[in-house]
């Protein structure tokens, strides 16, 4: 058993039919003596007398909030969570496998630019009784300081016959130069808990990994005289990290008609414009990549040919 | 300790040309081994990042660009001296601190050019003759280090009497070409900064 | 003990709006592992869920009604209480208040209360 | 909505016999799932939660089984004071949705 937060604690259990459970000793906060009893989750069923109540976790039904009265007096209480182990392995319940980049993935997290601001995003089924909370660290051992805010429901989407929660946070490591050649990983802790249920999941990587530049922006067209050709020019995108000189990237520029049968043409560039065939109802797209080190592409930024 | 925005001479920089070679050759090489080797911790989260220059040279510091040097978090200045000639050093106008900067990478290059040579030298003795480093990678790295054209003593080659580990040989082999990748990314931003500035 | 007693008018016309009172006792509402849900069961038919309020004051609906739901508390008088808007004939039914713990059952309930609404 | 199927919609049992209700649930809502017993012109009691948990007080003949989709409610021996209506409910996800409910009555 250990202690989460103030007043809330965590019973580890292996999961598994007729197991022992654990045995956990709750004492009163309180410099009472006599008089005490507990009752679990405000029942009026009083379990036991004393300072001290000892219980044996085995289920769900065990757990709760376990509080201790004098006299109709409420001295202190104790919420008692289950974090599950089946076959070794923690409970991922909570949480959906969002398979990307491989099996296994329950946060993923991306970082427009290397000032070390990032944003981690996970999804459930589960709309209600959910709580999380979200710590990070670069490097584990000894940590530095990484700032995350308050997860927040970030998107609601209907996945066939299932609703499913997008959730996110925002964190900024506390003291990050952009240019810095990193060797520890940032990681990324999330506690959930539904109902009594507690499970935690993580997530390490370092930013050069999850860099996803915004799209260029200003997409702009100038048609060539008697040509069937344009110059599309674009620009960096504004949370991009400076000077672009030193962070610069490379750009995919892409026409496309207006069925995704026909052919695309692409041309790579490391300028911020290029001249290109514009085919009549089709449409031109730009997207940006570190030019030298290869992370994600960012969406694509696009323009009508008309 | 940042570079100064010079107005170089057109033409200045031989050095960018070969950096982005440099950078083209490491990551073949770590694709390259990533799959040949891919029973072995190979890939950036199974490895320990070490950083053979550490405490050595100081490039991230001594190549900052300008504009970063109003950061405190990448004003961890460690004091390194290096020699200070070049031919990447076309114009008089390049300073002190531009001149400390492409040493710092000479140093780098030079350190890496010893370890991928020694390792090499294990690796051709090992039985499977599972991987050997990319000849083009090593000669690179000679070219960029000819650019830079800094006057420095020879390192000469680590030798072992001892029988090699090659499985530790081949996890150190992926150590250093993840180190390398990421040194060549930096080298390349900076070659691409000066050749703006 | 807990107990929980719904209030509010026998007969509502249509149209009109519905305010319907759960007072409560034996546990409160400002402790952060209870809740007060509205369920609602028509003659002869099944229970149907319609609001929830928990102790820090955040609320849900059954998107159905949602439109024409509010559910608010007084922790103070240990009240919760739930207005209807738009009542219609098919909205005659037993209306109860139950208490939902961190259990996430619903483990107390009111004896309920019958609306009928009618012209 | 995750809708709660019950089945079957009534039940006749003897005395002393035992009764097997089956709730399912259109979605996977994990053990989040509750029991209730409703007598004529009373409010429902609570028998099981997560599932499979007796309430305080529920005697042992009443057990609860399953998790995801499919769930059991199982009376061993029934009572004379068994007999009532047995509603399902998740509260996986809001909105929270009790079956149609199973009548078991004396045969």
């Known amino acids: 058993i250990w202690e989460l937060k103030k007043d809330v604690y965590v019973v580890e259990l292996d999961w598994y039919p007729d197991a022992p459970g654990e045995m956990v000793v709750l004492t009163c906060d309180t410099p009472e003596e006599d008089g005490i009893t507990w009752t679990l989750d405000q029942s009026s069923e009083v379990l036991g007398s004393g300072k001290t109540l000892t219980i044996q976790v085995k289920e769900f039904g065990d757990a709760g909030q376990y509080t201790c009265h004098k006299g109709g007096e409420v001295l202190s209480h104790s919420l008692l969570l289950l974090h599950k182990k089946e076959d070794g392995i923690w409970s991922t319940d909570i949480l959906k496998d969002q398979k990307e980049p491989k099996n296994k993935t329950f946060l993923r997290c991306e970082a427009k630019n290397y000032s070390g601001r990032f944003t981690c995003w996970w999804l459930t089924t589960i709309s209600t009784d959910l709580t999380f909370s979200v710590k990070s660290s670069r490097g584990s051992s000894d940590p530095q300081g990484v700032t995350c805010g308050a997860a927040t429901l970030s998107a609601e989407r209907v996945r066939g016959d299932n609703k499913e929660y997008e959730y996110s946070v925002e964190c900024q490591e506390d003291s990050a130069c952009p240019a810095a050649e990193e060797s520890l990983p940032i990681e990324v802790m999330v506690d959930a808990v539904h109902k009594l249920k507690y499970e935690n999941y993580t997530s390490s990587f370092f930013i050069r990994d999850i860099i996803k530049p915004d799209p260029p922006k200003n997409l702009q067209l100038k048609p060539l005289k008697n040509s069937r050709q344009v110059e599309v020019s674009w620009e960096y995108p504004d949370t991009w990290s400076t000077p672009h000189s030193y962070f610069s990237l490379t750009f995919c520029v892409q026409v496309q008609g207006k069925s995704k049968r026909e052919k695309k043409d692409r041309v790579f560039t490391d300028k911020t414009s290029a001249t290109v065939i514009c085919r009549k109802n089709a449409s031109i797209s730009v997207r940006a990549q570190d030019r030298y080190y290869s992370s994600s592409w960012s969406e694509w930024a696009s323009v009508p040919c008309s | 300790r940042n570079l100064p925005v010079a107005t170089p001479d057109p033409g200045m920089f031989p050095c960018l040309h070969h950096s982005q070679n440099l950078l083209r050759a490491v990551s073949n090489m770590l694709q390259k081994a990533r799959q040949t080797l891919e029973f072995y911790p190979c890939t950036s989260e199974e490895i320990d990042h070490e950083d053979i220059t550490k405490d050595k040279t100081s490039t991230v510091e001594a190549c900052l660009p300008l504009e970063l040097t109003k950061n405190e978090s990448c004003l961890n200045s460690r004091e390194t001296s290096f020699i200070t000639n070049g031919s990447c050093l076309a114009s008089r106008k390049t300073s002190f601190m531009m001149a400390l900067c492409l040493s710092s990478i000479y140093e780098d290059l030079k350190m890496y050019q010893v370890e991928f040579k020694t390792m090499n030298a294990k690796l051709l003795m090992d039985p499977k003759r599972q991987i050997f480093l990319d000849q083009n990678m090593l000669a690179v790295i000679d070219e960029l280090m000819q650019a830079l054209n800094f006057n420095s003593e020879t390192v000469p080659q680590k030798s072992s009497l001892e029988e090699p580990d090659f499985y530790k040989t081949k996890i150190k082999l992926c150590i250093l070409l993840h180190a390398f990748r990421i040194r060549a990314v930096t080298i390349d931003r900076v070659m691409s900064y000066l050749n703006a500035s | 003990e807990v107990t929980l007693r719904e209030s509010g008018p026998a007969l509502v016309k249509p149209t009109q709006t519905l305010t319907l009172t759960c007072t409560f006792s034996g546990f409160s509402l400002s402790k952060s592992v209870m809740g007060v849900s509205w369920i609602r069961q028509p003659p002869g038919k099944a229970l149907e869920w319609l609001a929830h309020i928990y102790w820090d004051d955040d609320k849900y609906y059954n998107p159905s009604l949602k439109s024409r739901l509010t559910i608010s508390k007084d922790t103070s008088k240990n009240q919760v209480v739930l207005t209807m808007t738009n009542m219609d004939p098919v909205d005659t039914a037993t209306y109860y208040c139950a208490r939902r713990g961190i259990r996430s059952a619903m483990d107390y309930w009111g004896q309920g209360t019958t609306v009928t609404v009618s012209s | 909505e995750i809708v709660m199927t019950q089945s079957p919609a009534t039940l006749s049992v003897s005395p002393g016999e035992r009764a097997t209700l089956s709730c399912k649930a259109s979605?996977?809502?994990?053990?989040?799932v509750a029991w209730y017993q409703q007598k004529p012109g009373q409010a429902p009691r609570l028998l099981i939660y997560?599932?499979?948990n007796r309430y305080t007080g529920i005697p042992a003949r009443f057990s609860g089984s399953g998790s995801g989709t499919e769930f059991t409610l199982t009376i061993s021996s029934l009572q004379s004071e068994d007999f009532a209506v047995y509603y399902c409910?998740?509260?996986?996800?809001?909105?929270?949705?009790f079956g149609g409910g199973t009548k078991v009555e004396i045969k």
């Open positions: 979605q996977s809502v994990s053990n989040d």
């Open positions: 409910q998740q509260d996986y996800n809001s909105p929270w949705t």
């Open positions: 997560y599932a499979s």
